[in-house]
């Protein structure tokens, strides 16, 4: 299921890098979050439950990434104007069924001001 | 008001098998999860099976390993094959369908908000 | 699984009197709690989803209230063809969907 645009603030931009924001709903307990950049897959994390309710989390294709009770940030580092592009959070849920995927996305737009490593 | 039609039941020896069918022309029946929902005569209702829109299946203990759920989204159709079947399994068989949306952080679950008559199926010797 | 209870079993009264049915459940389930009415020889019909939210169709006379364990439907002025047996629903902590057992409206 696409939903397009998210409709909160995916990016947040900090010392030359960006925090991309993927939300999930606080009911979801097992789930895949990846980061599509255009149609590239850029992260992933995948959170599952086993017996005795212990988390794992489990990374195919690693960034540095956050995770809360509602929301995947993945990070993105050294930004320059290559970056710019449709990013989308691609959420495949496991628990609780039935199985769902849901897609949000937005555009990553780079002003000088945002650049890491801006000559002066 | 959008209608569910139930075929495939009968009598049936113990061991047997028989194959439900759920059909509809009336709604988006690939936007839905579908289930069958059981009822013994003057009992309550039981929950038997569901299907995925992906095609992820879900079965209750008391059936796992004989019943099997199908979907075939382009004849707008739901199937169960019921094997091994057992004197516990007559009832009225219903096909039902739900909806479940998610967007961002919101999670919404709409209800089984279709039915159809329901099919009776009786496993005696 | 999550065990969904009903009380009471029956419930007797007359057309006009307000209506109060409720459905304990096992453990926390937020508002994923759904009502149904059911008629002799006839399917389950959807009156209550998301626990408060009234399906399509359904009279205004027909609430629902309640979250985590304890739900209440409530039918504020009965109407003779209100009486039949209601159900509730649970389908956030799954497999299995569970019902609960039904509580009978008779007529008084």
């Known amino acids: 299921e696409i939903n397009g645009s998210a409709n909160y603030e995916m990016f947040i931009f900090h010392n030359g890098g960006v925090q991309i924001l993927c939300k999930y709903p606080d009911i979801v307990q097992q789930f895949k979050m990846q980061l599509l950049k255009g149609g590239q897959i850029l992260c992933d994390l995948t959170k599952t439950k086993g017996s005795g309710n212990t988390v794992s989390i489990k990374s195919l294709k690693f960034c540095h990434s956050q995770l809360s009770n509602n929301s995947v940030s993945f990070f993105l580092y050294n930004l320059d104007h290559s970056h710019a592009n449709y990013y989308f959070c691609n959420l495949s849920i496991f628990d609780p069924p039935p199985f769902k995927v849901t897609l949000t996305g937005g555009y990553l737009h780079i002003y000088e001001s945002q650049l890491c490593c801006q000559l002066k | 008001e959008v209608r569910l039609v139930e075929s495939g039941g009968g009598l049936v020896q113990p061991g047997g098998s028989l194959r439900l069918s759920c059909a509809t022309s009336?709604?988006?029946?690939?936007?839905?999860?579908m289930h069958w929902v059981r009822q013994v005569t003057g009992k309550g209702l039981e929950w038997v099976s569901a299907?995925?829109?992906?095609?992820?299946?879900y079965y209750s203990d008391s059936v796992k390993g004989r019943f099997t759920i199908s979907r075939e989204d382009a004849r707008n159709s739901l199937y169960l094959q019921m094997n091994s079947l057992r004197a516990g399994d007559t009832a009225v068989y219903y096909c039902?369908?739900?909806?479940?949306?998610?967007?961002?952080?919101?999670?919404?679950?709409?209800?089984?908000?279709?039915w159809g008559q329901g099919t009776t199926v009786t496993v005696a010797s | 699984e999550v065990v969904l209870t009903q009380f009471p079993a029956t419930l007797s009264l007359s057309p006009g009197e307000r209506a109060t049915l409720s459905c304990r459940a096992s453990?926390?389930?937020?508002?994923?709690l759904a009502w149904f009415q059911q008629k002799p020889g006839q399917a389950p019909r959807l009156l209550i989803y998301?626990?408060?939210n009234r399906a399509t169709g359904i009279p205004a006379r027909f609430s629902g209230s309640g979250s985590g364990t304890d739900f209440t439907l409530t039918i504020s002025s009965l109407e003779p063809e209100d009486f039949a047996v209601y159900y509730c629903?649970?389908?956030?902590?799954?497999?299995?969907?569970?019902f609960g057992p039904g509580t009978r409206l008779e007529i008084k």
């Open positions: 039902t369908g739900d909806r479940t949306v998610v967007r961002g952080v919101n999670y919404y679950y709409y209800g089984m908000d279709v």
């Open positions: 009336e709604f988006i029946f690939n936007s839905y999860d």
């Open positions: 299907i995925g829109t992906a095609g992820d299946t």
């Open positions: 453990q926390n389930i937020r508002s994923y």
């Open positions: 998301g626990a408060s």
């Open positions: 629903q649970q389908r956030i902590s799954w497999p299995p969907i569970t």
